[in-house]
């Protein structure tokens, strides 16, 4: 039991100059047809240095970037660098914790969409700029106090019962994300991420939609409806173009298949 506790201690405390940052266990809640985004990252947040397929971290390169700071300024420590994989064509999964730890927060790569107000938010880092040959997904490790904002995906309209945000908080030695009060309905209208929004306390999430840490004997099952829930990504214009392209290709293939089938049918009729 002591070694287990020691391991937990190492896993959940990151030494940040001047303070200890407590990692949030598990992901923010998933809302059907919604995505989330952090507008700024609390000191102690880690971002994995991931490289796209065919590339790998440079030897002796950082495993992750770390949001650190002093009383006046916060910035990302370490730099992620990717180099061509001369050997195998695989992307090595770099995580500062063992794989059992469900500490992965993924956001799809995007051009840093950063509201102006976040630059001066004390104790927070802005979205780090992309690095060369970066993987398409960013894996963040959030800390207690982190807030993420939700918006409905394109084609869905937001019904707010309260704040569309989730905060990672710690009580009774366990971390959990509060439940955002957002429902996305299938009407053609999208909601926007806030440019500047004052943090509000979200209603309490309970065990069905939360996480715990330390001597946790069983994994939590997130029982919220997952149907059609998008990954924790932000839909960029590039993404939308890619989707549109895929849809166009699919329709083209179907049309061509249909025409080919019709011709075959005519041929077979002729031979009878």
């Amino acid at each position: 039991m002591d070694s287990y506790l020691l391991m937990w201690g190492l896993l959940t405390f990151i030494m940040v100059p001047g303070c200890q940052a407590e990692l949030c266990d598990d992901d923010p809640p998933e809302i059907p047809h919604a995505t989330f985004k952090a507008m700024a990252y609390k000191e102690g947040t880690m971002l994995n240095c991931e490289c796209k397929r065919g590339f790998r971290r440079i030897k002796s390169g950082s495993l992750y970037m770390l949001c650190t700071g002093n009383s006046s300024h916060s910035s990302w420590d370490n730099q992620c660098q990717c180099t061509s994989s001369a050997t195998r064509n695989t992307t090595k999964q770099v995580t500062p914790q063992p794989e059992e730890q469900k500490e992965r927060k993924t956001t799809e790569m995007q051009s840093p969409m950063q509201p102006v107000d976040q630059a001066s938010l004390p104790g927070h880092c802005r979205e780090p700029p992309p690095w060369e040959n970066e993987a398409t997904e960013r894996i963040y490790h959030f800390v207690v106090g982190q807030m993420v904002y939700y918006q409905c995906v394109q084609g869905y309209r937001a019904l707010h019962r309260g704040p569309a945000e989730s905060v990672c908080k710690m009580t009774h030695g366990k971390t959990r994300w509060t439940q955002p009060q957002l429902i996305c309905t299938g009407e053609m209208e999208t909601s926007q991420f806030p440019g500047e929004e004052k943090p509000q306390a979200s209603p309490e999430g309970r065990p069905e939609s939360e996480t715990s840490c330390l001597v946790t004997t069983t994994d939590f099952q997130i029982q919220t409806e997952m149907a059609a829930t998008m990954e924790t990504s932000i839909f960029t214009t590039e993404y939308q173009v890619a989707v549109a392209g895929c849809v166009f290709l699919l329709i083209s293939v179907l049309l061509l298949s249909g025409l080919t089938w019709q011709r075959r049918q005519r041929k077979s009729r002729r031979t009878i």
Epitope: K169, M170, T171, H172, G173, E204, R206, P207, E208, S212, V215, T216, T217, T218, D219, F220, Q221, Q223
Partner: antibody, heavy 118, light 106 residues
Framework: QVQLVQSGAEVKKPGASVKVSCKAS????????MHWVRQAPGQGLEWMGW????????NSAQKFQGRVTMTRDTSINTAYMELSRLRSDDTAVYYC???????????WGQGTMVTVSS | DFQMTQSPSTLSASVGDRVTITCRAS??????LAWYQQKPGKAPKLLIY???SLKSGVPSRFSGSESGTEFTLTISSLQPDDFATYYC????????FGQGTKVEIK
């Protein structure tokens, strides 16, 4: 109404184990963490640990680790706390408490008196 | 380890008095502090959560406040039913209770 009903008083010998039950009613049992708190005669409150009734995940205070086992039976909305290798200083009233409003303990069981005596 | 220092341990007061109980945390606990009232032979009863939020059904004469790591429970006008023992409870890092304050009749 929302309530927690605990099992009756127990008298145990040192070295033995005791299992206290806590039956929840009036709310969704799996929707709230259940905590165990004890109070020795004339003393203050001491937190022992929690169980997530939804998953069965548990977490106990370092003082009780290795001696306390928290379980639940969701079919009968009941949480259990078993304390082993009992000593005389384990004589106390044991409470189950629901972690509710604002993450504080909003609903408490009536308590179970456990006496450890040779 | 978190320490919750509650004071005073005993408080003698009369009906109608304004009563103040203090709890000091050994380190920051955000606002994760609750206050409970306990009467002899009974289970504790939640009064205040998140330092200053009054539980529904609890009389408004009870209030909670915080200033850094110091938390205060105030009973604006003590009633006969209020003579009991009061506990503070931090639940930021696991759970720790204060030693208790017994409010007795003067």
């Amino acid at each position: 109404q929302v309530q927690l009903v605990q099992s009756g008083a127990e008298v145990k010998k040192p070295g033995a184990s005791v299992k206290v039950s806590c039956k929840a009613s009036g709310y969704t049992f799996t929707g709230y963490y259940m905590h165990w708190v004890r109070q020795a005669p004339g003393q203050g409150l001491e937190w022992m640990g929690w169980i997530n009734p939804n998953s069965g995940g548990t977490n106990s205070a370092q003082k009780f680790q290795g001696r306390v086992t928290m379980t639940r039976d969701t079919s009968i909305n009941t949480a259990y706390m078993e304390l082993s290798r009992l000593r005389s200083d384990d004589t106390a009233v044991y409470y189950c408490a629901r972690e509710g409003e604002g993450d504080a303990f909003d609903i408490w069981g009536q308590g179970t008196m456990v006496t450890v005596s040779s | 380890d978190f320490q919750m220092t509650q004071s005073p341990s005993t408080l003698s007061a009369s009906v109608g008095d304004r009563v103040t109980i203090t709890c000091r945390a050994s380190q920051s606990i955000s606002s994760w502090l609750a206050w409970y009232q306990q009467k002899p032979g009974k289970a504790p009863k939640l009064l205040i959560y998140e330092a200053s939020s009054l539980k529904s059904g609890v009389p408004s004469r009870f209030s909670g406040s915080e200033s850094g790591t110091e938390f205060t429970l105030t009973i604006s006008s003590l009633q006969p039913d209020d003579f009991a023992t009061y506990y503070c409870h931090q639940y930021n890092s696991y759970s720790t209770f204060g030693q208790g304050t017994k409010v007795e009749i003067k």
